[in-house]
């Protein structure tokens, strides 16, 4: 028998420095977790102790903190090279800065193979990107070879900016011929490494003949066997075992997100490359693991540029940006409008001639807006200003909801109106009218939404049975501020871009902003 140790990360999202337990900015260092310096310590410890070790990443290194905003992927290549990753799969967020923003900082600089079998380049891009990412790679490990085949969410064109010259094929259809090719090369140990979410990971394990292990990402799935070491609740055991259609037991793993854990899977293969056994658990990268001093010194060196960036002007406002709780928790506020407009703008994707855009709606809990910005400081808006408005380091995500769920969400928005609570919703692409004289749960008297399947966008009444795409904070998608109906009833959830980054990009693009209060939210009683 031959034993392989797979170390894996996914959805690191720019968390190069250690973070707090909830993956936001580290405040109390003695309680902080993750970060590449700590990850390196643990990886090196395992490499020294065990003979056959692979370090893999299942995508979405890009996007999530000021590190990505400033360094645009160069930081990913540099520190993944320093940690000596063996392979990476492309995630949807690797396309956030377009194909050029993937090629230049990452594909050209990575000292490890970057993989995806279901992304096919066409047109002028085909030759430009040829060889820079691969469908699979055969890696020597000890005296054996292991095939790694990559895959990426086929929803990427709706979630990021891959352009028109990349075709995202069905994962299973694309993977099978590449796995077959590896078999003809006498590679009998094959890992599928990819970024399509846990449900697709399980399908790949079930349907793709010849795949021995699936290492996934995208859904931030936490798997654990035994008592979990932190706040994350396991979605199943680690590894999650899927019985394939041809009767094999295929381990499927994922390691939550944000570099908080290092996935650790030990696989035993027989001489024919069949999996005999698999066991392991994610390792919590808490403060009991020291940060590697040389990587930490490198992080501190790269950090300097970030501190300079946060005080530079992004753009100007010529109006007061009212982000006060007195406004945003009670009525339409122009800071809410600005943020929602930025959220929609960040999700403009012309993927279908029938639609002017795939999504037109935004909702945002008023309690998530934490500060106003005064225009009397020469109108200057900096990253620092925006960090005061959006201090939680969240993301603006894409969900699919039924109209009935949205209606419930708007009822929840005003179910205890007047107590300055955070659930009051700010909106974009939505016109809502409340009647507060009615009883809670029946206060929404009008709810019109902006059409997407139209050449001239206009507002139509919400249909209860229709499925709508909505951009909202991850906090709401996860049921925060009491929006349990969103969490329970959402039909799809894809994590998006860092909140501050979305707004800062929009302000930089617009240069001068002047958001107004324009009647998106109205009250039909005389007292408002």
């Amino acid at each position: 028998a031959w034993e392989l140790t797979i170390l894996h990360t996914n959805d690191v999202h720019s968390r190069l420095e250690q973070t707090s337990e909830d993956s936001s900015k580290c405040v109390n260092a003695s309680r902080c977790m993750g970060g590449v310096a700590r990850l390196f310590t643990k990886v090196q410890q395992i490499r020294r102790a065990e003979p056959n070790v692979l370090l893999l990443d299942a995508g979405d290194q890009y996007q999530g903190t000021i590190w990505f905003t400033v360094y645009k992927g160069a930081e990913v290549a540099h520190f993944m090279n320093a940690l000596r990753y063996d392979a990476m799969a492309l995630g949807n967020h690797e396309f956030d800065n377009g194909v050029e923003g993937l090629i230049e900082p990452l594909l050209k600089e990575a000292k490890f193979p970057i993989l995806s079998a279901n992304i096919k380049a066409k047109g002028p891009l085909a030759s430009q990107i040829s060889g820079l990412y691969l469908p699979y790679k055969v890696l020597p490990v000890g005296d054996e070879v292991v095939g790694i085949v990559g895959y990426t969410s086929k929803e990427t064109p709706f979630l990021s900016n891959p352009g028109t010259n990349l075709v995202f094929e069905d994962e299973i259809t694309a993977l099978q011929p590449e796995v077959d090719k590896l078999k003809t090369l006498n590679v009998n140990k094959i890992i599928a490494l990819g970024h399509s979410g846990f449900e697709m990971d399980k399908l790949i394990a079930q349907k793709v003949r010849g795949v021995d292990v699936v290492v996934g990402g995208h859904s931030n799935t936490f798997l654990y066997t035994g008592n979990p070491p932190s706040k994350e609740v396991p979605a199943g055991k680690y590894p999650f075992i899927v019985t394939s259609d041809d009767g094999r037991k295929v381990p499927v793993v994922q390691a939550y997100a944000f570099g908080k854990y290092l996935g650790y899977l030990k696989i035993e293969f027989d001489e024919r490359g069949n999996v005999i056994s698999s066991h392991g658990n994610p390792i919590l990268l808490n403060s009991s693991i020291p940060e590697d001093p040389s990587i930490k010194a490198d992080i501190n060196k790269w950090r300097i540029k970030l501190d300079n960036y946060s005080t530079q002007e992004l753009g100007k406002t010529i109006v007061y940006l009212d982000g006060s709780s007195q406004s945003c928790r009670f009525r339409e506020c122009n800071m809410g409008n600005l943020i929602c407009d930025a959220m929609i703008n960040n999700n403009l994707r012309h993927t279908d001639e029938m639609f002017w855009n795939h999504v037109s709606m935004c909702i945002l809990n008023g309690g998530g807006i934490r500060s106003p910005i005064d225009e009397r400081n020469n109108g200057t808006i900096t990253w620092e200003n925006l960090a005061a408005v959006l201090p939680f380091g969240g993301t603006f995500d894409l969900v699919q909801l039924k109209g009935s769920t949205l209606k419930k969400a708007f009822e929840h928005s005003v179910h205890r109106y007047g107590q300055s609570t955070g659930e009051f919703l700010q909106v974009g692409g939505i016109h809502v009218v409340y009647d507060l004289s009615r009883k809670p749960g029946d206060r929404v008297v009008k709810l019109d939404v902006l059409c997407t399947k139209c050449r001239v966008p206009s507002y139509d009444p919400l249909k209860m049975d229709e499925v709508y795409k909505v951009i909202l904070p991850n906090f709401l998608a996860n049921g925060g501020d009491g929006f349990q109906m969103i969490k329970d009833e959402l039909l799809r959830h894809d994590s998006g871009d860092q909140d501050i980054n979305v707004v800062s990009t929009y302000i930089s693009k617009m240069k001068v902003i002047y958001p107004a209060v324009e009647g998106r939210i109205k009250f039909s009683t005389g007292s408002h």
């Epitope: 230049e104 050209k108 000292k111 490890f112 430009q128 040829s130 060889g131």
Partner: antibody, heavy 117, light 107 residues
Framework: QVQLVQSGAEVKKPGASVKVSCKAS????????MHWVRQAPGQRLEWIGN????????KYNEKFKSRVTITVDKSASTAYLELSSLRSEDTAVYYC??????????WGQGTTVTVSS | DIQMTQSPSSLSASVGDRVTITCRAS??????LTWFQQKPGKAPKSLIY???ILLDGVPSRFSGSGSGTDFTLTISSLQPEDFATYYC?????????FGGGTKLEIK
């Protein structure tokens, strides 16, 4: 297949400059960095610098920084190495090499530069 | 700069022999080491990058191992076309630096 074809041998006087070319074919020129390396008689190989053909970004060995310029002509899929203020110790074979995964991987056939008065 | 020390500087062997060449770095270079072959008057030919990954078309009798500061190139069964000079280079950090070479001659 990947091919790097370098210009012919050069004989130069001390103090002069030399410009060596490296024409790439068999791949998209702008997609890979290009290294330049030299090998002087009886000496170990020396890395001179490299260039990103898509944007002209360069990295140079400090030893050569004041005298070397690496450029590209994207339309001709050609990289150039220019070395000025030549001295006898610059007599060497100069190689271009395509960079893959950070490392020089595919090499040109070399250009002999002789510096002699 | 990182110094690369190769040994031996020359080596005599016969067809079919197993040969090992070593390369030592003056500091940790992770696994970022390439081996290449050069024959007189010819362009260098890279064989292995990142310590142990063979470039396309390189025969499987060539293999590499090591990490940190100590690395080896092994040719499992020498063929007539393998007699040449072998070099290592590190690309962990700039400037890229080279070993002094090992000349492999027919015994």
């Amino acid at each position: 297949q990947v091919q790097l074809v370098q210009s012919g041998a050069e004989v130069k006087k001390p103090g002069a400059s030399v410009k060596v070319s490296c024409k790439a074919s068999g791949y998209t020129f702008t997609s890979y960095w290009m290294h330049w390396v030299r090998q002087a008689p009886g000496q170990r190989l020396e890395w001179i610098g490299n260039i990103n053909p898509s944007n002209g970004g360069t990295k140079y060995n400090e030893k050569f920084k004041s005298r070397v310029t690496i450029t590209v002509d994207k339309s001709a899929s050609t990289a150039y190495l220019e070395l000025s203020s030549l001295r006898s110790e610059d007599t060497a074979v100069y190689y271009c090499a395509r960079r893959d995964y950070g490392s020089p991987s595919y090499w040109g056939q070399g250009t002999t530069v002789t510096v002699s008065s | 700069d990182i110094q690369m020390t190769q040994s031996p500087s020359s080596l005599s062997a016969s067809v079919g022999d197993r040969v090992t060449i070593t390369c030592r770095a003056s500091q940790d270079i992770n696994s970022y080491l390439t081996w290449f072959q050069q024959k007189p008057g010819k362009a260098p030919k890279s064989l292995i990058y990142r310590t142990n990954i063979l470039l396309d078309g390189v025969p499987s009798r060539f293999s590499g191992s090591g990490s940190g500061t100590d690395f080896t190139l092994t040719i499992s069964s020498l063929q007539p076309e393998d007699f040449a000079t072998y070099y290592c280079l590190q690309y962990h950090e700039f400037p890229v630096t080279f070993g002094g070479g090992t000349k492999l001659e027919i015994k």
